[in-house]
């Protein structure tokens, strides 16, 4: 049977707004990723900032509702915005536990979902796990 959706929770210092109210934080140990049980959806999200081929996690948590993309099993980010020259925000939504912890690849900033990404790559069969 399904459990309530559980996602990795992270908010970089200085990030505007908080998604903490969209779930209940689990009491995890200091070495473990923070986890949040979603209150209003069965969907996780992740936001990464790609600057000069270096990806930095900005936010991870629960979405406020189930939307297109939430049926995805994995986090497949697509470019969303250019907060400053040379940096691109990538976001993903996905619908399995802790699916927002990692991404398998980032597509090139100019073309959403295009194969042959120029972004940070993981070897085939591996994933890049964001260090929290």
């Amino acid at each position: 049977p399904p459990n309530r959706r559980t996602c990795v929770f992270f908010e970089a210092p200085g990030v505007q707004g908080s998604t903490k109210t969209l779930g209940e934080l689990l009491d995890t140990g200091p070495e473990l990723p923070r986890a949040i049980r979603c209150l209003y959806s069965r969907c996780c999200f992740g936001i990464w900032n790609l600057t000069q081929d270096r990806a930095q996690v900005e936010m991870q948590g629960c979405r406020d509702s189930d939307e297109p993309g939430c049926e995805s099993l994995h986090c497949d980010p697509s470019p969303r915005a250019h907060p400053s020259p040379g940096s691109t925000l990538f976001t993903c939504s996905c619908g399995t536990d802790f699916c927002n912890a990692n991404y398998s690849h980032l597509p090139p900033p100019g073309s959403p979902g295009t194969p042959g990404s120029q972004g940070p790559q993981a070897a085939p069969g591996e994933s890049i796990w964001m260090a929290l």
Epitope: P1, P2, N3, R4, R5, T6, E24, L26, T28, L32, P33, A35, C38, L39, Y40, S41, R42, D66, T96, D97, F98, A101
Partner: antibody, heavy 113, light 112 residues
Framework: QVQLVQSGAEVKKPGASVKVSCKAS????????VSWVRQAPGQGLEWMGE????????NFNEKFKGRVTMTTDTSTSTAYMELRSLRSDDTAVYYC??????WGQGTLVTVSS | DVVMTQSPLSLPVTLGQPASISCRSS???????????LEWYLQRPGQSPRLLIY???NRFSGVPDRFSGSGSGTDFTLKISRVEAEDVGVYYC?????????FGQGTKLEIK
């Protein structure tokens, strides 16, 4: 097919610890929570908590906080539940389950002086 | 903690007859994601519990269609349309909406 095989019965003295193992097969171990439930003799079922093997995140019943540790070894697809400072009322059959759908056969832990 | 109250606690039934078990929760089990984390288990004598129903009304794989679940909010029912000998045991309702997850006290079904 999905199978969960638990370690054998244990007899412990009050104040001691017990570690029950649960070896999973027939599915991707890291994709499902492992739940732990216990049942005292002639009594009902009591939820102890659960752990997600991929990252060791766990969610406990507050009643057992500080006394219970749940861990997993993904290389052997085995989950462990350790209960410390045992008391006579911890005498029970301890079950592991794959996110509550497939259950192990149970491990009887007897606490007696 | 959410208290799950089952009735009756003992249920003698004639083979081939229907049976019904009620489960009431002290708080609503509908979660914010609009899913209700209510399950039913059968524990046959000397065996491990076995999942019958999840999400109020979804039969788990391999569970005969004579078992059905219904209800919402705080009021839930498990029905067996025609009781068979293999249905003997203790039935538990369980909620996974609120922490800690909790079981009902069990309903013992026996053949008259």
């Amino acid at each position: 097919q999905v199978q969960l095989v638990q370690s054998g019965a244990e007899v412990k003295k009050p104040g001691a610890s017990v570690k029950v193992s649960c070896k999973a097969s027939g599915y991707t171990f890291t994709d499902y929570w492992v739940s732990w439930v216990r049942q005292a003799p002639g009594q009902g079922l009591e939820w102890m908590g659960e752990i997600y093997p991929k990252n060791q995140v766990s969610n406990f019943n507050e009643k057992f906080k500080g006394r219970v540790t749940m861990t997993t070894d993904t290389s052997t697809s085995t989950a462990y539940m350790e209960l410390r400072s045992l008391r006579s009322d911890d005498t029970a059959v301890y079950y592991c389950a794959r996110q509550r759908d497939y259950w192990g056969q149970g491990t009887l832990v007897t606490v007696s002086s | 903690d959410v208290v799950m109250t089952q009735s009756p606690l003992s249920l003698p039934v004639t083979l081939g007859q229907p049976a019904s078990i009620s489960c009431r929760s002290s708080q609503s089990l509908e979660y914010g994601d609009r899913y209700t984390y209510l399950e039913w288990y059968l524990q046959r004598p000397g065996q491990s519990p076995r999942l019958l129903i999840y999400g109020v009304s979804n039969r788990f794989s391999g569970v005969p269609d004579r078992f059905s679940g219904s209800g919402s909010g705080t009021d839930f029912t498990l029905k067996i349309s025609r009781v068979e000998a293999e249905d003997v045991g203790v039935y538990y309702c369980f909620q996974a909406t609120h922490d800690p997850n909790t079981f009902g006290q069990g309903t013992k079904l026996e053949i008259k």
